[in-house]
Interface confidence: medium
């Protein structure tokens, strides 16, 4: 590594990430007809202006609007699902309820799903050495700055009833610092969203509680309460079982409480 | 190099059946949209079929909907047409071509054809 | 389904000077800020062959005496100096919607 090259605290650009987009985007063309007409290379290019030559350390909003533009997607307001620390739960329960989207199933939250990427101030480099670290280097890094701006959009666009999964297993049920806490959560439009639905996700196959009496959650409810949004809460004490009766709601089994 | 080598085009009775062949060379074949064009003698181009990489999105011209099907087989980096219920007006030069990579609807690369004559 | 009307039919033009040929859409075929709209060139016997997409990008290995313009409904390729293995049938497409739709040809023959 050449010594000037700036050191940042997190892990470099995602191995073949330029291949990596470009083949995602044209599988999610393929995939969903109402977006087969998005053209690929152009979506990439502005995905690479959004950061190539740019302090890593300094991108906006403003830097993604060409690849929003791009990317533009209308998908059932009504049919939104948050998500916050528990994505792969969320994302096989949208695989399973395909009238339902989390942000990762619109072609931009499919593009970047678990990448990295960054760039270098003056060059035109991709740095696969390393990026910033949202903590220890800086907030306003490109892979910040692209979520916040892709789930506040995502948000914005949500209506009626929306739903979002939690984690009953962490300390913070709910966490302002999150995603969903920081960006989502005061996105939701009141004139357009009635409810706010929490999904609680346990953990433990013998966990009993009521996780929706969690202190977190009553400052979830509070803080939508007052942005005159309804709440409603819902413990799901076997995500296991709550799959498989989305799967086969005719089941038996399924008329019990999961 | 990139090749595309069409196959199984003949003389065939109105009403009859012919499944056309399209042998890929030279690219990734799993990573590509393909589509069938034809050519009617001395006529223009007319877009016939596509086909998706992985087979999930398929889409017809109206004038062969029911009447034909696009199919693909990665493993062997062919691509086929099969047409039933020929019709005179299906007659023409059909043409295998490869979808530009980045976007949907669009031939970067054509084979040389095969003539299918629909006649009594 | 868009038309595509191309204009003219024919073109006799003298080698070394300017071809040009309009392809006009029913209906545009913009859409996310770039035109859908591409130009091949067929030679007698053979398959056609991909000059220009979204209506300005010249593929690769093509000479850049050809160049393709406009947007919307209304587009043109231009042949800047024509050569004698130019002459060929040039056809538009444009992949806004489904169906593909082609144009009817221009020939181009030099005078």
């Known amino acids: 590594v050449p010594r000037w090259r700036q050191q940042w605290s997190g892990p470099g650009t995602t191995k073949r990430f330029p291949e990596t987009v470009l083949a995602r985007c044209v599988k999610y063309t393929e995939i969903h007809p109402e977006m087969r007409h998005v053209d690929c290379q152009s979506v990439w290019d502005a995905f690479k202006g959004a950061f190539i030559s740019k302090h890593p350390c300094n991108i906006t909003e403003e830097d993604y609007q060409p690849l929003m533009k791009l990317g533009t997607q209308t998908v059932p307001c009504n049919k939104i699902l948050l998500w916050s620390r528990i994505k792969d739960l969320a994302h096989q329960f949208t695989q399973v309820q395909r009238d339902m989207f989390t942000l990762e199933d619109t072609l931009l939250g499919y593009l970047a799903d678990d990448l990295t990427w960054c760039g270098e101030f003056n060059t035109s480099k991709i740095n696969y050495q390393s990026c910033p670290d949202w903590r220890k280097d800086c907030s306003n890094n490109p892979v910040s700055v692209f979520w916040k701006t892709v789930s506040r959009r995502f948000a914005e666009a949500a209506c009626d009833v929306v739903h979002v999964m939690l984690n009953g297993s962490r300390s913070k049920i709910f966490d302002k610092n999150s995603t969903f806490g920081s960006v989502e959560v005061h996105n939701l439009q009141p004139e357009k969203v009635q409810t706010l639905e929490a999904w609680v996700i346990h953990g433990g196959r013998e966990d009993s509680r009521d996780l929706c009496q969690d202190p977190t959650i009553k400052e979830l409810e509070s803080i939508i309460s007052k942005r005159n949004i309804q709440f409603s809460c819902k413990n799901i004490y076997r995500p296991d079982k709550f799959l498989q009766c989305v799967k086969n709601p005719e089941d038996s089994s399924c008329t019990s409480e999961i | 190099e990139v090749q595309l080598v069409e196959s199984g085009g003949g003389l065939v009775q109105p009403g009859g059946s012919l499944r056309l062949s399209c042998a890929a060379s030279?690219?990734?074949?799993?990573?590509?949209?393909m589509h069938w064009v034809r050519q009617a003698p001395g006529k223009g181009l007319e877009w016939v079929a596509f086909?998706?990489?992985?087979?999930?999105?398929?889409y017809y011209a109206d004038t062969v909907k029911g009447r034909f099907t696009i199919s693909r087989d990665n493993a062997k980096s062919s691509l086929y047409l099969q047409m039933t219920s020929l019709r005179a007006e299906d007659t023409a030069v059909y043409y295998c071509?490869?979808?530009?990579?980045?976007?949907?609807?669009?031939?970067?690369?054509w084979g040389q054809g095969t003539t299918v004559t629909v006649s009594s | 389904d868009i038309v595509m009307t191309q204009s003219p039919d024919s073109l006799a033009v003298s080698l070394g000077e300017r071809a040009t040929i309009n392809c006009r859409a029913s209906?545009?075929?913009?859409?996310?800020?770039?035109?859908?709209m591409h130009w091949y060139q067929q030679k007698p016997g053979q398959p056609p062959k991909l000059l220009i997409y979204r209506a300005s990008n010249l593929e690769s290995g093509i000479p850049d005496r050809f160049s393709g313009s406009g947007s919307r409904t209304d587009f043109t390729l231009t042949i800047s100096s024509l050569q004698a293995e130019d002459v060929a049938t040039y056809y538009c497409?444009?992949?806004?919607?489904?169906?593909?739709?082609f144009g009817g040809g221009t020939k181009v023959e030099i005078k």
């Open positions: 497409q444009q992949s806004n919607k489904d169906p593909l739709t």
């Open positions: 030279g690219f990734t074949f799993s990573d590509y949209g």
């Open positions: 209906e545009n075929v913009d859409n996310y800020g770039i035109s859908f």
């Open positions: 071509a490869r979808n530009y990579v980045s976007s949907y609807g669009y031939f970067d690369y």
């Open positions: 086909i998706s990489s992985g087979s999930s999105s398929i």
